[in-house]
């Protein structure tokens, strides 16, 4: 029960990619507003997105303080124009989110192939080290900085003339693969965190093929 015409938020859902983290919920407000609070399991509640009519709240600034912590959020519902009003229990209606551990749960963003270079029968493929919103010593950390060797990349590569995808893996951002002389190859990469049980893979990078601008060919 709560104040007349005030309903509790529901379907609280974390949407997070490369640590950019937004809490979403329902319903679209009718004569009510929302405030979000976030806390670690052992910490104090911090209020965000005060008296908003949105049904989402960007909590990135809070979760990047320690991405290995487990966070809980809650969404308070208030009557529009009367935010001091409380429910029958003496406090506003609220709903808890599921727990969220960014390090284990943030989705891996789509990677990008930065470059590839062929030297004879070897090709070096480099994956862009994407910047995150996680900070250390006032600088933004890359995905590799945050995950270290927990993050690997799987390279799919194939001759332009065939469909079978060979694979290679690296725990850096570079691959060195053997190719057949005189053949053009295409490449796509996928970020993977094998130690996870869910959200292990990113979507595939855009496909890049030899003979396009990103690559360089050198005959040795």
């Amino acid at each position: 029960s709560g104040t007349t015409n005030t309903v509790a938020a529901y379907n609280l859902t974390w949407k997070s990619t490369n640590f950019k983290t937004i809490l979403e919920w329902e319903p679209k407000p009718v004569n009510q507003v929302y405030t979000v609070q976030i806390s670690t399991k052992s910490g104090d509640w911090k209020s965000k997105c005060f008296y908003t009519t949105d049904t989402e709240c960007d909590l990135t600034d809070e979760i990047v303080k320690d991405v290995k912590q487990t966070y809980l959020a809650r969404v308070f519902s208030y009557p529009a124009g009367n935010v001091e009003s409380t429910g029958s229990a003496g406090e506003p209606l609220y709903e808890n989110s599921p727990e969220f551990t960014p390090y284990l749960e943030t989705n891996l963003g789509q990677p990008t192939i930065q470059s590839f270079e062929q030297v004879g029968t070897k090709v070096n493929v480099t994956v862009e080290d994407e910047r995150t919103l996680v900070r250390r010593n006032n600088t933004f950390l890359s995905l590799r900085d945050v995950f270290g060797k927990d993050l690997i990349y799987t390279l799919y590569y194939w001759k332009s003339s065939s469909s079978g995808k060979k694979t290679a893996k690296t725990n850096t951002n570079e691959f060195l693969i053997d190719v057949d002389k005189g053949e053009n190859y295409c490449f796509s990469v996928q970020a993977v965190i094998p130690s996870r049980t869910v959200n292990r893979k990113s979507t595939d990078s855009p496909v890049e093929c030899m003979g396009q601008e990103k690559g360089e060919f050198r005959e040795i």
């Epitope: 690997i152 799919y156 995808k165 893996k169 996928q190 993977v192 094998p194 292990r200 893979k201």
Partner: antibody, heavy 120, light 107 residues
Amino acid sequence: EVQLVESGGGLVQPGGSLRLSCAASGFTISDYWIHWVRQAPGKGLEWVGYIDPYNGYTYYADSVKGRFTISADTSKNTAYLQMNSLRAEDTAVYYCARDYGSLEVSLDYWGQGTLVTVSS
Amino acid sequence: DIQMTQSPSSLSASVGDRVTITCRASQDVNTAVAWYQQKPGKAPKLLIYSASFLYSGVPSRFSGSRSGTDFTLTISSLQPEDFATYYCQQHYTTPPTFGQGTKVEIK
């Protein structure tokens, strides 16, 4: 508990077709890779091919290329091996296996296998 | 394709014996080598991964090592349940390839 269960094996005539299924439980196949490996009677292990169920990418051994097709239905958490133009030398126990996908660990869980006999 | 040449193809040993099986890769595979145990009518089971790491639940009498492109599986003290066929496998490149297998029999 991670489990892989193959089904669909049986007796088929040369030139015939068969579809094997690999039903997974205890994990989501799109988070991993699924391989098929076969073993002819009294022989060693031979890799057949793999699929990444997340994007549908596949690769096949030369011995089956153009005849076998691996697919996956992520809604059913099941991978398939479609075998066409079967030959006597395809007679084997067919296993599906999960690829953990790290640099260190490859095939960590295997199914119990299903026997395919190609004979007239 | 990378060839994995496994030896011996079979061996006879007694309970308590130290048993060594080797695999040679035809080119560099780094440490991307696994060892599997297979008993008749059963699926292979992972024993060793990344050349030398013991997989969860595998007895410590099993060990693996690498020297360049040579890989070794050692059973320090053979137990009755260890009589089986053992396979090495490389997963450094596609296609992954297996050794021919080593059957460990009772002497």
